[in-house]
Structures are given as C-alpha cells and as structure tokens.
C-alpha cells in the first residue's frame, strides 16, 4: 500500500509532490488564516486549475483537462488550508502548480512541482526459443525510465540488453538474458528512482531429478528470506513446460489462502504452506511427466522462480515388457 503522494520539502515556498499514474494526490498549500479568502491554482502559470472566492468555487474558466478532477478541503479553508485534491493524475499533469492565496491581510504564492511515476508490477519470465533458454525481465508500463541490473550468482553482469518501447505516457521495457546451459542463479532488479520502488526477480535452477515411472517426485520451492514478507500479498504458481509452453498445475493465493489444483496427481502440504514452504509432490509419474517444472512466487515487489528438471525413466518392468 502506498501513500496518496509524498512531499519533498525544498526552499522558497516550493514543494515537490510525487504521485502515481491514475491515483489521487494532494498538492499542499497553507496560509495564515484570514477573511476574504481567494484561492487560485494554476498550472505552468497559464492554465486555470481551480478558483475559489466569495465562499465558493468559480470554475467557469477552468481548463477542461481539470474538469471534475479538482476540489479543495472546504471545511479547512478557514484554518489556512488551501491544498488541492487532485484526482486521477496522468503524466501530462506533471509540472509546476502555483497556488495564489489572498486574504484581507496578505497575499501569498506557493509553488508545487508535481512529478508522476508509473510502475506496473514487472514480471520475470523463463522462455525457450529453439535450443536457447532466456530469462526476461519486463515491465509493461514504467515512468521515468527505470534502472535495470542483472546479477549472476550475486555478481553484477555488465551485459544488459534493453528493448524499449515508448508510448505517449510511459515506457514498456524488456530485458532478456540468454542463460542457455547455465546452472547459475540469476537476479534482475528494476528500480523506479522517482517512486523509490524496487522490484526483484530471482531465478534458481535446481539439480535435475531422475525418477522411475510410477514413482512420485517431491519438488522444493521455498522463498528467499531476503525478499519474502509473509504479510504481503503473493501468489504461488506451479507449472510444467511442454512443447515450449507452460501449463499451470496449481496455484495458491495468500490473500484468500485459496489453493487451486488443475492436476489430480499434484499435492501440496497445507502445513508446509503455513510455514511458507511451497514444495509440491507429483504422484504416479509417467514418461510424459519429464520436463521442466517452474515454481513462481510473485508479489508487487519480487518474483522468485525456481526451475526443476525431471527425467522420468521407464521402470524395469515396463522396459522388460517392451
């Protein structure tokens, strides 16, 4: 949960307010209380955002882009509060706002700089392209341009491809990393410096498991304590890769503590889940169960991917029958 907006105090009657795209914010302004209050909010010294005088709003010449998006704290005006409540900010709203307040005793002008950030939750994906394996860190909508860093076994990697698409109001970013043939662990961090928000994706490849047909396999999936906070909503998904695409076996939602299982031979231990251990069992293995199994633990702040490779071999009985 993030605050409505946060203020950075800077000198000369100027404040910086940082808001999130499509959320509501408050542009702060205060004055020494007095009678005959006049309040004019303007954008970039040109566009009328909100006017209040003679005890009521006067929005006849308000710029259309602010229609139905602004209001004052009317019960607080007599206490010296001229702050503007601003609904559904967009990136086009970024800029300098001036609050003019006149009373019977003085006139004051406050400047507020509005910066708007976007950070739709990024994702880390594991993809197979022909014989190559890729990890892709991507964020569908982000502003300003984020800082993306990769680590391999906790060591920063200088190679960092970034595929960037700019739209009118934000960037869409993909950062792919070729991990073909690697058993290392990888970490991708995407940081939005404006919103002071960081997301981390972590990928771990477990040792391959060899099982016989009809046996069961237990695949571990435990979050790394550095990232995992049980108080935060998260989702756990187990899926299996077949023919280059993943099919979901089961998932768990922490918010509702709901478990949905799509594969009858899949089982989760409820007691272990309560201890934040999302290891799973797959019973009665058959040859077609060979492949890669992916555990994905995701929240707003991280994605933890754990890959298991399972090889199912024919049992001696089956082999002798052939």
């Amino acid at each position: 949960i993030f605050p409505l907006a946060f203020f950075i105090y800077v000198p000369m009657n100027e404040q910086i307010v940082i808001g999130r795209l499509d959320e509501d914010i408050i542009l702060p302004s205060s004055f020494e209380r007095g009678s005959e209050v006049v309040i004019h909010w303007k954008y970039q010294d040109s566009y009328k955002v909100h006017s209040y005088y003679k005890g009521s709003d006067h929005l006849e010449s308000q710029d259309p882009r602010y229609a139905n998006r602004t209001s004052l704290f009317y019960n607080e005006i007599q206490n010296g509060n001229a702050s503007l409540f601003f609904r559904r900010v967009s990136l086009l709203d970024e800029g300098i706002y001036t609050c003019y307040v006149g009373t019977a005793i003085q006139v004051i002008t406050n400047k507020v700089v509005l910066k708007v950030g976007v950070f739709l939750t990024p994702v880390m994906k594991y993809e197979k392209r022909n014989t190559n394996s890729f990890l892709i860190c991507s964020v569908l909508s982000v502003y300003p341009r984020p800082i993306i860093t990769w680590k391999m076994d906790n060591t920063p990697i200088s190679e960092n491809n970034m595929e960037e698409t700019g739209s009118l109001d934000s960037f869409s970013i993909n950062s792919p990393l070729n991990i073909t043939g690697s058993n290392s662990s990888y970490e991708c961090t995407i940081e939005n410096s404006l919103l002071k928000q960081t997301w981390t994706g972590r990928w771990t490849m477990k040792d391959g498991l060899h099982k016989m047909q009809s046996e069961h396999v237990s695949l571990s999936c435990q979050p790394v304590n550095d990232y995992f906070s049980p108080n935060q909503d998260f989702k756990v998904t187990w899926s299996r890769m077949k023919s280059g695409t993943f099919s979901v076996l089961a998932y768990y939602l922490s918010s509702s503590q709901n478990t949905i299982i799509n594969e009858s031979r899949f089982s989760w231990n409820k007691e272990l889940i309560n201890q934040s251990d999302f290891s799973m069992n797959l019973m009665d293995l058959n040859l077609s169960d060979s492949g890669e199994y992916l555990c994905n633990i995701s929240s707003d702040e991280y994605t933890l991917l754990t890959i298991h490779t399972v090889h199912v071999e024919p049992s001696q009985e089956t082999a002798s029958h052939n």
Epitope: E36, V38, K42, K54, Y100, G102, V107
Partner: antibody, heavy 121, light 107 residues
C-alpha cells in the same frame, strides 16, 4: 505606503481615443487585481473594468464593453485603460483602485487621486 | 445588473448624533457589500466590506449590518470629520454597482 497615480487625462473629441495610465508603488503589483472606477462631474461612482493580478481575467461594465481595453504590465507596475470611440457621457474623473487581492473580490481598498477625462466637441 | 438604492439622498445631523444610512439591492447579494466615504474633491475611502467588517484604520464609530437585500451603515456618534458622501457597492457579481450616494451634512 500604497500609492496609485493616474495620468493621461485630458480633453478629447467624441469618437477619438485616449489612453490612461496608473503607476503603482508600495505593494507587490503582480499580486493584486486593479479596477478602473469613474465619476462624472457631480455624479455618483461607476465601476468601469477590472484586470486580475495575472491578467488572466478582464471584465467590463456594459457601458464600455467593446470600446475600452484594460491591460497591465507587471514588470513595470503599470495599468492602462485604452479608451476608443469616446462619447460625451464618458466624461468623468477616472480612478484606478486596488482590489482586496487577485481581482476576484470586487471591492476597492486603495484608490488613486483620479485623472479627469473630458469628451467634448 | 443589480440596482443599488440608497436612502436618504441627503441627511443633515448634529455632532454626536447616531446616523443610519440604508442601502437596498434589487436582488440578494448575500453579504457582498462595501461602504465608502468620499470627501469633497477626494477619492473614495473604504469603510466597511462584507457588509459588516470594519476596514483596518477606520474609526470604530462606523459599523455595517445586513444581508440579502437590506443593509445599513451606522455612525454611532457623528463627528465633524464625517462630513462626506457615502456610497454602498455590491460586489456579488459583475457588473459591480454603486448606490447613488448619501450626502451627509452637519447641522
């Protein structure tokens, strides 16, 4: 202290033009709306026009709309009233007067001494 | 436009008298009314704003009251210096309009 000094008055023929000025001092000019108010000889007061602190809004009395134009130069602390198509009934002392604040309130806290405009053939 | 009507047009009173001037608006103007004093040959001076608020520096013998359409300016104890014409003005809406004035004479 607040001072407003009007100038530019004089005798002019009907149909001609005249430009009045108002020089302000003793306050932050760009913070306040300024009005023109006139008074015909021996008569009452009549509001003429207002310009807001940032010149974003200008309003005129019906009797002068389309003929008079109010403007300001905040860098020079001056207010102007361009009067075109003057009529005999525009004869008056013209006062510039400072609004309580932005110009939105509409009453007059400080007044200049006035400048006389006489429209006569 | 909103019409403002003052009464009386002329008023003669003695020093020390309590004097009342009335102003009526042609439609409701809430409390958006100001009173001015104009001495001969001088610019007007603001006395009262918002119907009853005394402007800074104005003697406390001046007071205003009323709301809606009926307003009064009262001088509690008339002084020789109060010889002037008094105007009411509505600032509820453009165009701002004045009353025709009340000339106050000292007996």
């Amino acid at each position: 202290q607040v001072q407003l000094v009007e100038s530019g008055g004089g005798v002019v023929q009907p149909g001609r033009s005249l430009r009045l000025s108002c020089a302000a001092s003793g306050f932050t000019f760009s913070d306040y709306g300024i009005h023109w108010v006139r008074q015909a000889p021996g008569k009452g007061l009549e509001w003429v026009a207002v310009i807001w602190y940032d010149a974003s809004d200008k309003y005129y009395a019906d009797s002068v709309r389309g003929r008079f134009t109010i403007s300001r130069d905040n860098s020079k602390n001056t207010l102007s009233l361009q009067m075109n198509s003057l009529r005999v009934e525009d004869t008056a002392v013209y006062y510039c007067a400072r609004d309580r604040s932005s110009g939105a309130m509409g009453y007059f806290v400080y007044w200049g001494q006035g400048t006389l405009v006489t429209v006569s053939s | 436009d909103i019409q403002m009507t003052q009464s009386p047009s002329t008023l003669s009173a003695s020093v020390g008298d309590r004097v009342t001037i009335t102003c009526r608006a042609s439609q409701s103007i809430s409390s958006w009314l100001a009173w001015y004093q104009q001495k001969p040959g001088k610019a007007p001076k603001l006395l009262i704003y918002k119907a009853s608020s005394l402007e800074s520096g104005v003697p406390s013998r001046f007071s205003g009251s009323g709301s809606g359409t009926e307003f009064t300016l009262t001088i509690s104890s008339l002084q020789p210096d109060d010889l002037a014409t008094y105007y009411c003005q509505q600032y509820n809406s453009y165009s701002y309009t004045f009353g025709q004035g009340t000339k106050l004479e000292i007996k």
